[in-house]
Interface confidence: low
C-alpha cells in the first residue's frame, strides 16, 4: 500500500533578521521519502538543513520534517521538495506574520 | 527489470564536448531520478551531478562551469554533456538511479561507459 | 570538501572470516548519508547499505553497517568467496558528494 504525505510549511523567528522554515510531512506510508528545501530551484547544500528522524505517528504511517534558517524576506526565493513512492511535490514557505515559535536550532 | 545504459563516443578530442546518453527501462523518468558518476581506470568513483524527477538539476561544484545533465522522457534518455575535455576526463562514465527514500543513494547502475580523450 | 578516508587500504582474508572495513569523514557526516558500495573487476559498483545500516534490496544479512559522526563501519560477518571485491563509502552529506578511495577484499 502507498499512502501520500500531506505536506506543511511553517516558519518561526530564529534571530533578528532571520527565520527558521520547517517542512514537515506526515501521515506517509511506507517510511522512504525525500524531504529537502531549495533556493531559487537549486537544492540547498545538506550541511545547511536539519532532518528530523522519520517516526511512526501511530496510524501506521509516518513523520518527518527539514528545517532551514534563511533571511527574512526572502521567503518566496525557497520551497520545499518532497518525492515518495514516484510523486513529487514542491512546497513555497507561506507569506504574512512571523509566528515565535520554539525553534528546531 | 530495471535497467540503465550507458551510451557515446568512446574516443572525444581534448577541448571538444563529451556527450553521453542513458537509455533507461523498467521504470518511469518522471518518478526517479539519475546521478552521473565517472571512475578514471585504476581510480575511485567521481560524483559529477544528477536530475531529480522535476528536472532540477545538482552538480558537483567541481564541473559547474561545463556541465549540463538533462532529460529526455520521449525517449527514455538522459543525457551527460561535458564541454571542454582534456585528458583527466578520461574515464568509465556510469549512470545511476536515485533510489526513493535512500537518500541519494545510488540503487540501480549502468554498466559504464569507457570514454578516452585524446587527440 | 568532506574526503573519506577508508582502511585498510587492502584486507587479505580468508573465506568463512570476519571482515572489517573502516570509513573515516574529515567532518561530521549525518548517517542518513553515508552508503557503501560494492565493486567487482569490469563491474559497475553496486548498493549495498544505505544510511549507515540498512541493507539495500537483495544483500545477504551478513553485511552490515554501523557508525555515527565521522567513524563508520562494515562489517562481513563471515566471507563468501563472491565477497571479495574492492568497497566504497560515499557521503551526500555535504556537496561535494565524495567516496572513499576504496577498500580492495582480497582472498589470503
Known amino acids: 500500500r502507498t499512502v501520500p504525505p500531506m505536506v506543511n510549511v511553517t516558519r518561526s523567528e530564529a534571530s533578528e533578521g532571520n527565520i527558521t522554515v520547517t517542512c514537515r510531512a506526515s501521515g506517509f506510508y511506507p517510511w522512504n521519502i525525500t524531504l529537502s528545501w531549495r533556493q531559487d530551484g537549486v537544492s540547498l547544500s545538506h550541511d545547511t538543513q536539519q532532518w528530523g528522524d522519520v517516526l511512526p505517528d501511530g496510524n501506521g504511517t509516518y513523520q518527518t520534517w527539514v528545517a532551514t534558517r534563511i533571511c527574512q524576506g526572502e521567503e518566496q526565493r525557497f520551497t520545499c521538495y518532497m518525492e515518495h513512492s514516484g510523486n513529487h511535490s514542491t512546497h513555497p514557505v507561506p507569506s504574512g506574520k512571523v509566528l515565535v515559535l520554539q525553534s528546531h536550532w | 527489470q530495471v535497467q540503465l545504459q550507458e551510451s557515446g563516443p568512446g574516443l572525444v578530442k581534448p577541448s571538444e564536448t563529451l556527450s553521453l546518453t542513458c537509455t533507461v527501462s523498467g521504470f518511469s523518468l518522471t518518478t526517479y531520478g539519475v546521478h552521473w558518476i565517472r571512475q578514471p581506470p585504476g581510480k575511485g568513483l567521481e560524483w559529477i551531478g544528477m536530475i531529480w524527477t522535476d528536472g532540477t538539476t545538482d552538480y558537483n561544484a567541481a564541473f559547474i562551469s561545463r556541465v549540463t545533465i538533462s532529460v529526455d522522457t520521449s525517449k527514455n534518455q538522459f543525457s551527460l554533456k561535458l564541454s571542454s575535455v582534456t585528458a583527466a576526463d578520461t574515464a568509465v562514465y556510469y549512470c545511476?538511479?536515485?533510489?526513493?527514500?535512500?537518500?541519494?543513494?545510488?540503487?540501480?547502475w549502468g554498466q559504464g561507459t569507457l570514454v578516452t580523450v585524446s587527440s | 570538501e568532506i574526503v573519506l578516508t577508508q582502511s585498510p587500504g587492502t584486507l587479505s582474508l580468508s573465506p568463512g572470516e570476519r571482515a572489517t572495513l573502516s570509513c573515516t569523514a574529515s567532518s561530521s557526516v549525518s548517517s542518513s548519508y553515508l552508503h557503501w558500495y560494492q565493486q567487482k573487476p569490469g563491474q559497475a559498483p553496486r548498493l549495498l547499505i544505505y544510511s549507515t545500516s540498512n541493507l539495500a534490496s537483495g544483500i545477504p544479512d551478513r553485511f552490515s553497517g554501523s557508525g555515527s559522526g565521522t567513524d563508520f563501519t562494515l562489517t562481513i560477518s563471515r566471507l563468501e568467496p563472491e565477497d571479495f571485491a574492492v568497497y566504497y563509502c560515499h557521503q551526500y552529506h555535504r556537496s561535494p558528494f565524495t567516496f572513499g578511495q576504496g577498500t580492495k577484499l582480497e582472498i589470503k
Open positions: 545511476a538511479r536515485k533510489g526513493h527514500g535512500y537518500y541519494y543513494a545510488m540503487d540501480y
